[in-house]
């Protein structure tokens, strides 16, 4: 019996035309939502003038339906048993699942001012930037609508730069009508224990963002894992959102719509400083902001973002060192709300439910030559927003799963 089931599973999780896995893999049957909470800055003037703590108040959720588009350019390679594809991006606003509209206004850090002052460190260039910032009446903070902040707006300061620069700014710009990839993953035909594991991303086995093992593209994309998952396993996966591979460890058994699943979570150790977790040494890319690599819980992904000083963390700086959150008032981290988890059906390796949580932050530093940053006395890693991307297997699919997979085993 068990062997027959194993054989069936092995056959059905292969990523090729005609299998259950392939059908759900090409276009997810699960509705995936991305909820955003924006950190509205309450005291912009006091911060700019006196270098006060930044008081933030989160506003949300603002919900979008995402990952509803089928994978594109799906191409099998029989020679190396891989399948390559592009994952198109799309987001549809869901007013009924949101606290307001895309036209809601927020006071947030001026992304262009913070980024330009970081990218251009030369003092003379900063003086040029300063004159353009003043001319455009830009400041350290700005008021932007949700739509502008997420999907892009024409920045008045950058529009004055007299040489070619991208003048459109947005945390996820460009998004709609773009695609992530190309991914090339093993289809499992020759070796089921490699199914869905990424062979190359954008044609490479490494990212070129990090040193040493940190630069590796490990595991799957977290939508599924090779079958027959054990509780003792460390599940590696790659997330292009955070420009790195990461891992999850078993936390508990969960019953999801009658299906026994394993809950795997991202442990705090994954976000630890190299002092606590020496493996993380290569995620520490500079010594000043990281206080000689002793800070933890924030990841500098500027190399992956054309030099813009973007830092990724968990929401509300969960698992981050006190020095990171000290200059920010109004944060309340808690594991239940702010950690990331994957609920994996162990026989198939399919992720049947997940909650991916992350926070987007921007570094802003004092600048002698930029008037609106001149009074700052310290560096700030400023939270802009946090997101919760969730998906749960639908009732119909769960019934099918119970009858065809778990029911047959039990």
């Amino acid at each position: 019996g068990d062997l027959l089931i194993q054989k069936t599973i092995k056959k059905q999780v292969v990523l090729e035309e005609g299998t259950i896995a392939f059908k759900n893999w090409v276009k997810t049957g699960t509705e995936v939502y991305r909820q955003f909470w924006i950190f509205d800055v309450q005291n912009p003037q006091e911060v700019m003038m006196n270098s006060s703590n930044i008081q933030v108040k989160q506003r949300g959720p603002y919900t979008y339906r995402v990952r509803f588009l089928a994978k594109e350019n799906v191409t099998q390679d029989a020679e190396d048993n891989t399948v390559s594809f592009l994952q198109p991006n799309g987001a549809i606003f869901e007013p009924s699942l949101s606290v307001g509209t895309e036209a809601d206004n927020f006071t947030v850090l001026n992304l262009a001012v913070a980024a330009a002052s970081h990218i251009y460190q030369n003092q003379f260039v900063q003086m040029i930037l300063n004159s353009l910032i003043n001319k455009s009446k830009s400041s350290m903070f700005q008021v932007r609508t949700l739509r502008e902040l997420l999907w892009g707006y024409r920045d008045p300061f950058l529009s004055l730069v007299p040489y070619p620069v991208t003048t459109t700014v947005g945390l996820f710009y460009p998004y709609n009508n773009t695609a992530d990839g190309v991914y090339k993953v093993f289809n499992g035909k020759d070796n089921i224990s490699k199914v869905a594991i990424i062979d190359t991303y954008k044609g490479k086995r490494n990212l070129s963002y990090w040193e040493s093992h940190c630069d590796m593209i490990n595991g799957t994309d977290a939508a599924s894992f090779p079958p027959f998952v054990e509780k003792s396993q460390v599940l590696q996966f790659f997330s292009s959102d955070i420009c790195r591979s990461i891992y999850a460890v078993f936390e508990s058994d969960v019953n999801l719509k009658g299906i026994p699943v394993y809950r795997f979570v991202l442990p705090s150790k994954a976000f630890a400083s190299p002092v606590e977790n020496p493996d993380n040494y290569c995620f520490c890319t500079e010594k000043i902001i990281s206080k000689n690599c002793t800070s933890y819980g924030v990841l500098d992904i500027s190399k992956c973002k054309e030099g813009r000083p973007v830092y990724i963390s968990l929401p509300h700086f969960l698992y981050a060192s006190p020095d990171v959150s000290e200059p920010i008032d109004g944060l309340n981290p808690n594991e239940e709300e702010h950690r990331t988890y994957l609920d994996i059906e162990p026989i198939t390796g399919f992720t049947l439910q997940f909650a991916k949580r992350l926070q987007v932050n921007l570094l802003v530093k004092p600048s002698e030559k930029i008037q609106v940053l001149k009074n700052l006395k310290r560096n700030y890693i400023v939270p802009i927003l946090w997101l919760n991307e969730t998906g749960t297997i639908g009732d119909e699919k769960a019934n099918m799963f119970r009858s065809q997979v778990t029911g047959k085993i039990n």
């Epitope: 251009y120 030369n122 003092q123 003379f124 260039v125 003086m127 040029i128 300063n130 004159s131 007299p162 040489y163 002698e368 030559k369 008037q371």
Partner: antibody, heavy 115, light 107 residues
Framework: QVQLVQSGAEVKKPGSSVKVSCKAS????????MQWVRQAPGQGLEWMGG????????AYAQKFQGRVTLTADKSTSTAYMELSSLRSEDTAVYYC????????WGQGTLVTVSS | ETTVTQSPAFMSATPGDKVTISCITS??????MNWYQQKPGEPPKLLIS???TLRPGVPSRFSSSGYGTDFTFTINNIESEDAAYYYC?????????FGQGTKLEIK
């Protein structure tokens, strides 16, 4: 050692243009911006503008906006200042000088505008 | 635009004297003031850069002080070779602006 060597003296007719060169050596050219300063006979110093060879960032003094063009050629470590629509008041010694604090100067180029 | 008012325009001193030159700016420029010496037929020479930093090789009898809008340049124990024009330059904001210059004559 750091050296800035400028092109030779020029005599120009009113309405014409002049292009002064400044060849840098002894440091990595794109590491520092190049500023241009002029000094009319018996007068003080006047900043004209500056260019950062690395980014191409340029700033001009309002007075010269539209008449002066600064360029930098990283391959030859040379900066150029071109001044157009010359008038007699443009008769001056033109200096290139490095960085915001003007730490090294060229020897100067005398431009005489005369009909 | 930050205007820089330098005074005096002319001063005369005897070797061994102490002289001071003043530069006042129309806006707060922190400590971004630089001081130069220029002798006839030569380009200016940087003596003191932002933050009252004496340049390598410049004699210690030259010094400066000031912050915000008021700046002072001092030469202690003047020597005959100090006869020259002296200029201040603010490098806090664009356009960069010079003082009008001070001619120092040694009797």
């Amino acid at each position: 050692q750091v050296q800035l060597v400028q092109s030779g003296a020029e005599v120009k007719k009113p309405g014409s243009s002049v292009k002064v060169s400044c060849k840098a050596s002894g440091y990595r050219f794109s590491d520092y911006e190049m500023q241009w300063v002029r000094q009319a006979p018996g007068q003080g110093l006047e900043w004209m503008g500056g260019i950062d060879p690395e980014t191409g960032g340029i700033a001009y003094a309002q007075k010269f906006q539209g008449r002066v063009t600064l360029t930098a050629d990283k391959s030859t470590s040379t900066a150029y200042m071109e001044l157009s629509s010359l008038r007699s008041e443009d008769t001056a010694v033109y200096y290139c000088t490095r960085k915001l604090d003007f730490d090294y100067w060229g020897q100067g180029t005398l431009v005489t505008v005369s009909s | 635009e930050t205007t820089v008012t330098q005074s005096p325009a002319f001063m005369s001193a005897t070797p061994g004297d102490k002289v001071t030159i003043s530069c006042i700016t129309s806006t707060d420029i922190d400590d971004d003031m630089n001081w130069y010496q220029q002798k006839p037929g030569e380009p200016p020479k940087l003596l003191i850069s932002e933050g009252s930093t004496l340049r390598p090789g410049v004699p210690s009898r030259f010094s400066s002080s000031g912050y915000g809008t008021d700046f002072t340049f001092t030469i202690n124990n003047i020597e005959s070779e100090d006869a020259a024009y002296y200029y201040c330059l603010q490098s806090d904001n664009l356009p960069l602006t010079f003082g009008q210059g001070t001619k120092l004559e040694i009797k």
